[in-house]
């Protein structure tokens, strides 16, 4: 017959024949023949191989690093790579998650639009009209004014994006 | 470990059939193709038959061809050669090897045939 | 067919020198399929070399294997004394036959 130009998934064309391909977890060790399958071995510990593969050498597991701020997240399989989180206060500096950096906060003025996770950094969004904000803080929302009104009082200092607003006691010597 | 061990070597008359077994042990047996290579005394080697891992192809050397059947029972781990009709010129040491694409990696220690009267 | 004719027949040298043995082929062997094998009295063939040139595993790195096409050559390049014995090469790509050559020995000289 003549030799295949193309195999099926799964299988992989080395000198004109057809090889199954290694399952995930597995290397490759010897290709087939016409008379023996495709010769696969275990990956070691710490390594992996996510794919149907030919790969001759596993990959090694990421290493959570504790001095660039990495912890282990999930621990890696024979077929799946070690995921990396940061420590709490960090987050990730990219999708690898490679290093950690503090989380930002958010200065006076503005407050936490959304709380940093391990993967993604604090989000500010500045204190609109009627809200502020008056530390520095990766927590904190902006807060309302207070409503004087509602205390029977008067506003004596408006607020700002950074400040309150002061309420007083009523002027009672009003014609 | 990986080994391979040949057994069913002796003295046969010429005309007279003969079975050898191969026991397998330290790898899969079911996935690999198996050979057989004899040697006769003071020669070279010569490759003799080939069976693939399920049984289903079988490719024999001519000069055994309609005499030798090459066989496998993977659930006891073991490949056989039937020889019959054996011949003065039969007599050698048979080794069974595996089959990879390095050629044939693990051998067997060899059994003796002798074809006498 | 594919006829394997190795030279020379026998190789007489002392331990330390160069060993080069060859190996041609009747027809160009496809894929480098060529095997070397090491054979000392009383026992099995081992693979040495496959693939022409790929070292088999536990093999010492004395020995190398080059060619191709028609024509293979097996090195060991400081003979020790366990390397004397008798060297074969066989053809895997075109069969049947599996063909082995004639055999090189390799005696202390």
């Known amino acids: 017959p003549e030799p295949p130009t193309a195999c099926r998934e799964k299988q992989y064309l080395i000198n004109s024949q057809c090889c199954s391909l290694c399952q995930p977890g597995q290397k490759l060790v010897s290709d087939c023949t016409e008379f023996t399958e495709t010769e696969c071995l275990p990956c070691g510990e710490s390594e992996f191989l996510d794919t149907w593969n030919r790969e001759t050498h596993c990959h090694q597991h990421k290493y959570c690093d504790p001095n660039l701020g990495l912890r282990v997240q999930q621990k890696g399989t024979s077929e799946t790579d070690t995921i990396c989180t940061c420590e709490e206060g960090w987050h990730c500096t990219s999708e690898a998650c490679e290093s950690c950096v503090l989380h930002r906060s958010c200065s006076p003025g503005f407050g936490v639009k959304q709380i940093a996770t391990g993967v993604s950094d604090t989000i500010c969004e500045p204190c609109p009209v009627g809200f502020f904000s008056n530390v520095s803080s990766a927590f904190e929302k902006c807060h309302p004014w207070t409503s004087c009104e509602t205390k029977d009082l008067v506003v004596q200092q408006a607020g700002t994006n950074k400040t309150d607003v002061v309420c007083g006691p009523q002027d009672r010597l009003r014609a | 470990q990986v080994q391979l061990v040949e057994s069913g070597g002796g003295v046969v008359q010429p005309g007279r059939s003969l079975r050898l077994s191969c026991a397998a042990s330290?790898?899969?047996?079911?996935?690999?193709?198996m050979h057989w290579v004899r040697q006769a005394p003071g020669k070279g080697l010569e490759w003799v038959a080939v069976?693939?891992?399920?049984?289903?192809?079988?490719y024999y050397a001519e000069s055994v061809k309609g005499r030798f059947t090459i066989s496998r029972d993977n659930s006891k781990n073991t490949l056989y050669l039937q020889m019959n009709s054996l011949r003065a010129e039969d007599t050698a040491v048979y080794y069974c090897a595996r089959d990879t694409s390095r050629g044939h990696d693990i051998w067997g220690q060899g059994t003796m045939v002798t074809v006498s009267s | 067919e594919i006829v394997l004719t190795q030279s020379p027949g026998t190789l007489s040298l002392s331990p330390g020198e160069r060993a080069t043995l060859s190996c041609r082929a009747s027809?160009?062997?496809?894929?480098?399929?060529l095997a070397w094998y090491q054979q000392k009295p009383g026992q099995a063939p081992r693979l040495l070399i496959y693939g022409a040139s790929s070292l088999a595993t536990g093999i010492p790195d004395r020995f190398s294997g080059s060619g191709s096409g028609t024509d293979f050559t097996l090195t060991i390049s400081r003979l020790e004394p366990e390397d004397f014995a008798v060297y074969y090469c066989?053809?895997?790509?075109?069969?049947?036959?599996?063909?082995f050559g004639g055999g090189t020995k390799v005696e202390i000289k």
């Open positions: 069976i693939s891992y399920e049984g289903t192809k079988k």
């Open positions: 027809q160009s062997v496809s894929y480098s399929y």
């Open positions: 066989q053809q895997y790509s075109d069969y049947p036959p599996f063909t």
């Open positions: 330290g790898f899969t047996f079911e996935k690999y193709g």
